[in-house]
Each structure stands twice: as C-alpha cells, then as structure tokens.
C-alpha cells in the first residue's frame, strides 16, 4: 500500500463542472491508503467532509467509511476521465443525511454500494436511477446495502421513511438487475406494495430487525430467483395463506423467521399446517408462540388445531368494560 499527499489536480463536476485539472492516474489522496495491486483505496475514519477529488483511476474498491460527509450531491463521484473501474463503494457510517439524485452517476461499473449506518433524512427518488425519467438507463448495481439508514425521530420528515426508500428503489426501473438488497434495522412498519415487483432479479433480501407486522399486502410472486429472505426480528404475528402460497411457489427460496412474536390463535392454523410440510423455512423448529399468554414459548411445529383457538367475540350487550 502507498499513502501520498495530495496536490491540486482533479475534481468532480458537481452539476456545473466547476472544478480542476484531470487527476494523475495513480495518485493517492491525502488521508487515504491506496493499493494499486488490490485496486483499493481506503479513506477510513478521517473525518472527511467531501469525497476526495483526486481518486486514482485504477480504483475498483473504495472505502469511505467513518467520515462526516453529510451530503452526497449530484455527481459526487463524477470525474474526468470517469472512475470507470469503480465496482464497490462503501460509505457506511459517514454521517450522511442527504443523498441527492444522480449522486452515483458516471460510475459505469458500480456493482456494490453500501450506505449502511447513515441517518438518511433525505434519499432522493433518483439517488440510484440518476434521472427522473419514467424508465431510466439500467443501473449497474447488483448489491445494495441499506442497513440502519433510518434517521432519528427528530430528523424524520412528514412523509413515511418506508415510502422514501421505496421511491428510490423503484424509480425509473433502474434496479431491475439488483441481486442483493439489505434493508435490516430500519424500523420499517410495512413494505410498500409495489417495491418487490420492480426488483425481479433479487436473490437475497434482508428485512430483518424491522417492525413489520404483516406481509398481507406484499407480493413475492415475481421474485422467482429469490434464494434468501430474512424476516427475523420483526413484529410478524402470522403469515396468511396468500403469502404462504407465494413463498411455497418460489423454487429456490429459504426463509428465515426467527424471533417474531407469533400469535398462536385460530388464525395461525394454516401457517402451522404449512410449516409442518414446507422445506422453505430455515430453523422452523425454533419458532415459538409469543401470544396469547397461555401459549407463550410453545413450539409452532408441535401445535395442532385443538391448540389454536380464538376467544369468541361477545355481542356488545354481553361485553364488559
């Protein structure tokens, strides 16, 4: 590895191309470590407030973690000549709260993007598509890692965080080639209805450690390539027939359902029957009831229909307050 002090050469064109001279092709920015052999640049934990302007053209793997970037403007990585080799970009834990449309434009080889652990109060609908066209040029992204990007409550906007993220995922149908999507630890209460339909190539979907209560309005039908679906540590109470049938119909899928507060009443009967016969659910023998109290910690696979009853709903005249 080499580390070098920087000169004034190079800069991206942020909307207006007000910048500098083209970079020396193998120069290492100040505060970064570079390995041309590994095609890797690491500018980690350096309190950077902007993306370095003089990145070497050979960079394939760029780590900008643990900085203070705050905002990624349009063309944040655009260079003349472009960073044509950049394939993996890790921006996790860099205090980003704003990612604008076109932030990742002019990165023709970008296959993996990690924005995890940034409190994204604003994620432009066009952050990944780069344009506001109804159908935009396909993004080269194959892996998109967005774990723990939910901002603190006082920084959340009026519109739903789920909706903001969903809009960025579906804009321009740009992410049709996405294979991996991680959305863990985002306090999601629901999954917007049409998101998955726009991501037909998904093989791995991580929605663990959210607050999903139901999958009733989510369709997995299009995800014929899906291999792993992580739904651990949510607030799921039961999976209904439509969801069960869709999951069963996916040829390669493995579903992870641990640590959800399953409600073992009469509505659980279909799910229990399905669990007993399916090979789709990994660790299904670990799934236990959380409610009602009398069923707590009972193993779902050990239940039978007689165990799964619902208290009768009393007519209003017989109800007591």
């Amino acid at each position: 590895t080499s580390s070098a002090s920087s000169s004034s050469s190079s800069a991206p064109f942020l909307a207006s191309a007000a910048s500098a001279q083209p970079p020396l092709p193998d120069q290492c920015p100040a505060l970064c470590e570079c390995s041309e052999a590994a095609r890797t640049v690491k500018c980690v934990n350096r309190n950077l407030t902007e993306v370095p302007t003089d990145l070497p053209l050979y960079v394939r793997n760029l780590f900008l973690t643990g900085n203070q970037l705050a905002v990624l403007p349009a063309g944040a990585f655009a260079r003349r000549p472009p960073l044509a080799e950049l394939a993996a970009l890790n921006l996790s834990g860099s205090r980003l709260d704003e990612v604008r449309g076109g932030a990742f434009e002019h990165l023709p080889s970008l296959r993996q993007l990690d924005l995890s652990h940034n409190p994204l109060a604003y994620l432009s609908p066009f952050a990944f598509s780069g344009s506001n066209a109804s159908i935009s040029a396909p993004s080269p992204l194959v892996e998109l890692i967005l774990n723990h990007i939910v901002p603190p409550d006082d920084k959340r906007q009026n519109r739903s965080f789920e909706g903001m993220v969903a809009a960025a995922l579906v804009a321009g149908r740009a992410l049709q080639g996405l294979h991996l999507l991680e959305l863990a630890s985002n306090h999601f209460l629901y999954l917007p209805r049409d998101v998955l339909a726009q991501l037909p190539s998904l093989r791995y979907l991580d929605l663990s450690n959210n607050s999903l209560v139901s999958l009733t309005y989510v369709s997995f039908r299009n995800l014929t390539h899906l291999e792993s679906l992580h739904l651990e540590d949510n607030a799921l109470k039961v999976l209904h027939n439509g969801t069960l049938a869709e999951l069963q119909g996916l040829p390669h899928v493995r579903v992870f359902l641990d640590n959800n507060p399953w409600v073992c009443d009469c509505h659980m009967a279909d799910m229990v029957t399905w669990l007993k016969q399916t090979g789709v659910v990994q660790g299904k023998d670990r799934l236990t009831c959380a409610f009602p109290e009398k069923m707590r910690n009972r193993v779902l696979l050990e239940l039978n229909s007689a165990d799964l009853d619902c208290d009768p709903i009393l007519p209003p005249s017989l109800q007591t307050s």
Partner: antibody
C-alpha cells in the same frame, strides 16, 4: 480569537504569476476547510477556490480553473493560492475564509484581504 | 450555475424602521435536511461578516434585530429596528453545489 491574514498581493503584468498566502491563528487550522473569495473593485463577491481540511478535496470556479492552484500547509497554519496566466479581470481584493465543510458550510471567518492588480 | 437575485439593489430606511432584503435562487437550495443559503454583511473597506447561516440561524454575536426566513427559492433578510451601524452591503450566498455563488448585493443606507 480567530485571525486570518492574507499577503502576497501587488501589481502583476498580464500573463504573469503571483502566490498569495493566508496565515491562520486562533483556531485549529487543520480542522477546517478553506476558501479563497475575491472582490473586483466596486463589484460583488466571487468564490474562487476551496480546499478541504486534509487536502483531499479541491474545487475551483470555472473562471480560474487550470490557472489557479489552492494548497495548504497544516503544520504551518498557512493557506496558499498560486495564480498563473493572470488576466486583467483577475484584478481584485482576495480574501481567505474559513468553513467547516464545503456544502454544509459557510464563510464564518474572513481575512482583511490582499489586493492583486493585473495591469501592464 | 445557480443565480441568486437580490432585490432591491439599494434601499434607504429610517432609523428604527424595518429593512427587508430579498434573495431569490434560480433553483431550490433547500432539502428536507438543510437549507443551503447564508447572509453576509460588508461595510466599506472591510471584509464580509457572516450574519445568518442556513436561512434562519443567527451567527453567534450577531444582534437579534437581524433575522432570516425562507426556503426553496425565496429568502428574506430582515433588520428591525435598523441602527446606524447597519449601513452596509448585504449579500446572500448558496452552498447547494459548486460553484458557490453570491447575490449581487443590496446596499442599505439610512434616510
């Protein structure tokens, strides 16, 4: 007290070169991004160039791109602006200014300025 | 480039009255997380001085008679009550993108 003191201005012929300096004191220079801003006689303010705290990022106005180079020496608490191929329209008062970051920042401290006159 | 249009170019206000200066951007300079518009005061023969950052946040040490409002493309600097020492030129500036640009300035004089 935050202090920025520019120097190096003077009379330069068109096509000539000049190097401006800005000496900083009263704050941790290496923690702040720095700008050069200029003001032509009886005119408004024009942003010229920016350098990040650790010299990882550099930005220039189109009017000076390729002719001016911003740099800094953190151990010596000094900011520089190397100006080449000077033109009459570069005649101005040149100010250095401090910022906490480029886009999320603002010019929160200014020097008194140094005058550059480009004339034959 | 983003153009900031200040109006009026100059104004004369009586002591104790209100001065209102407008700054209009050619495109939005606000996001849901930050407003990228700042105000400066420049007195003759002196460098500019930061008054208000992010549209409405008073810089430390600036008198409370200065206030800023606005978001998106329309911003206002108010001075009330105007004092003699407020005679100066006032500039707005955006930091939305490169290049950073300033308005042309508004010269405030006392009647």
């Amino acid at each position: 007290d935050v202090q920025l003191v520019e120097s190096g201005g003077g009379l330069v012929q068109p096509g000539g070169s000049r190097k401006l300096s800005c000496a900083a004191s009263g704050f941790t220079f290496s923690n702040f991004g720095m700008h050069w801003v200029r003001q032509a006689p009886e005119k408004g303010l024009e942003w010229v160039a920016y350098i990040s705290s650790g010299s990882t990022s550099f930005y220039y106005a189109d009017t000076v791109k390729g002719r001016f180079t911003i740099s800094r020496d953190n151990p010596k608490n000094t900011l520089f602006l190397q100006m080449t191929s000077l033109r009459s329209e570069d005649t101005a008062m040149y100010y250095c200014s401090r910022t906490n970051s480029l886009l999320r920042g603002f010019f929160d401290a200014w020097g008194a300025g140094t005058t550059v006159t480009v004339s034959s | 480039d983003i153009v900031l249009t200040q109006s009026p170019a100059s104004l004369a206000v009586s002591l104790g009255q209100r001065a209102t200066i407008s700054c209009r951007a050619s495109q939005s300079v606000s996001s849901s997380s930050y407003t990228y518009l700042h105000w400066y005061q420049q007195k003759p023969g002196q460098p500019p001085k930061l008054l208000i950052k992010s549209a409405s946040n008073l810089e430390s040490g600036v008198p409370a008679r200065f206030s800023g409002t606005g978001s998106g493309t329309d911003f206002t600097l108010n001075i009330h009550p105007v004092e003699e020492e407020d005679t100066a030129t006032y500039y707005c500036q955006h930091s939305w993108e490169i290049p950073l640009t300033f308005g042309a300035g508004t010269k405030l004089e006392l009647k």
